[in-house]
Interface confidence: low
Amino acid sequence: EVEKTACPSGKKAREIDESLIFYKKWELEACVDAALLATQMDRVNAIPFTYEQLDVLKHKLDELYPQGYPESVIQHLGYLFLKMSPEDIRKWNVTSLETLKALLEVNKGHEMSPQVATLIDRFVKGRGQLDKDTLDTLTAFYPGYLCSLSPEELSSVPPSSIWAVRPQDLDTCDPRQLDVLYPKARLAFQNMNGSEYFVKIQSFLGGAPTEDLKALSQQNVSMDLATFMKLRTDAVLPLTVAEVQKLLGPHVEGLKAEERHRPVRDWILRQRQDDLDTLGLGLQGGIPNGYLVLDLSMQEALS
């Protein structure tokens, strides 16, 4: 096929249309002008080319734009985006949210690929921070996106963007990530009233310190056990039995089912058995009556 480099008579493409899916690879290479392809990229996605044909089209664009594609081409890549390597994408300068959405749409339903991860990274770095619109878009396509970021990366999320976060977006976040996100959420929702505030802040409470949990216990919030089990152990340990009872409200009965699991198990070990007995749940493992409880952390602070 090496000698078949000239375009056969009458086969020169005048426009990008359906007839091209019947071209052999070498005919596409010889008969489709790269500049024509670049100006009519929006049509490529409407034509069911085979992947082998898409490889040829990509090769033509690569030759035309060795330094990276312009955004006008990138926005209309469609299925051709799936042919791009992370190395290709690193050459791009994507600034438009519409371009990002168009490319994420192509990958919709598939797991986040290295290409998509690189694209998002390029886009966010170009913007300087994860603004609300970007976060809205990314979490709509990839609910786990936020939890895939490092604590350092999360630090660039402005508090205003937290409004875009849904509870399921935080499902896979670990405590280190919630430690970064919680203060931002607290700031974002600070002007809401008690019950509304709790609904919004609830998903972020895995990063809350003891003093904030104590404050919540005074507000009749009725925290569910699932949320309680995600709290930081070190934040739960200093809470008194009375504070936990107020914090959980009617859900306090659920402690019995969780008494062998953290943070409930560790919290029980720190409480006086007398106090635990007041709950009437049969929780065992508290400090027996007559024992002196030394708060070692306080002792260390004084020495």
Epitope: A46, P48, T50, Y51, Y79, L82, H110, S113
Partner: nanobody
Framework: QVQLVESGGGLVQAGGSLRLSCAFS????????MSWYRQAPGKQRTVVAS???????SYADSVRGRFTISGENGKNTVYLQMNSLKLEDTAVYYC??????????WGQGTQVTVSS
């Protein structure tokens, strides 16, 4: 093991109809693009019709208006309704499934013979 199995081929008189089916199994995903190709004796395999996962279709000029490709991607089957068959439609018809990041999968083919 991904398998594409074609059926529905056979001997038919010119002007008659056939409906080819392609069922794929052994995969939990759906294909981005399903196509029917054909290969006549001594000729290259060429694409006849294609359907994308969102329902876009495309046809070779020689079959447009006579053949209809359809499919329910979620049900893992694609069809080729062939009407007004001509002698030159005689060929082995192959099903092709393609998905991004995954190689293309071919079926074994089903023979269609149009007689006068």
């Amino acid at each position: 093991q991904v398998q594409l199995v074609e059926s529905g081929g056979g001997l038919v008189q010119a002007g008659g109809s056939l409906r080819l089916s392609c069922a794929f199994s052994g995969t939990t995903y759906t294909f981005d693009l399903m196509s029917w190709y054909r290969q006549a004796p001594g000729k290259q395999r060429t694409v006849v019709a294609s359907i994308s996962s969102d329902g876009r279709t495309s046809y070779a000029d020689s079959v447009r208006g006579r053949f209809t490709i359809s499919g329910e991607n979620g049900k893992n089957t694609v069809y080729l309704q062939m009407n007004s068959l001509k002698l030159e439609d005689t060929a082995v018809y192959y099903c092709l499934g393609q998905r991004s990041g995954v190689r293309a999968f071919w079926g074994q083919g089903t023979q269609v013979t149009v007689s006068s």
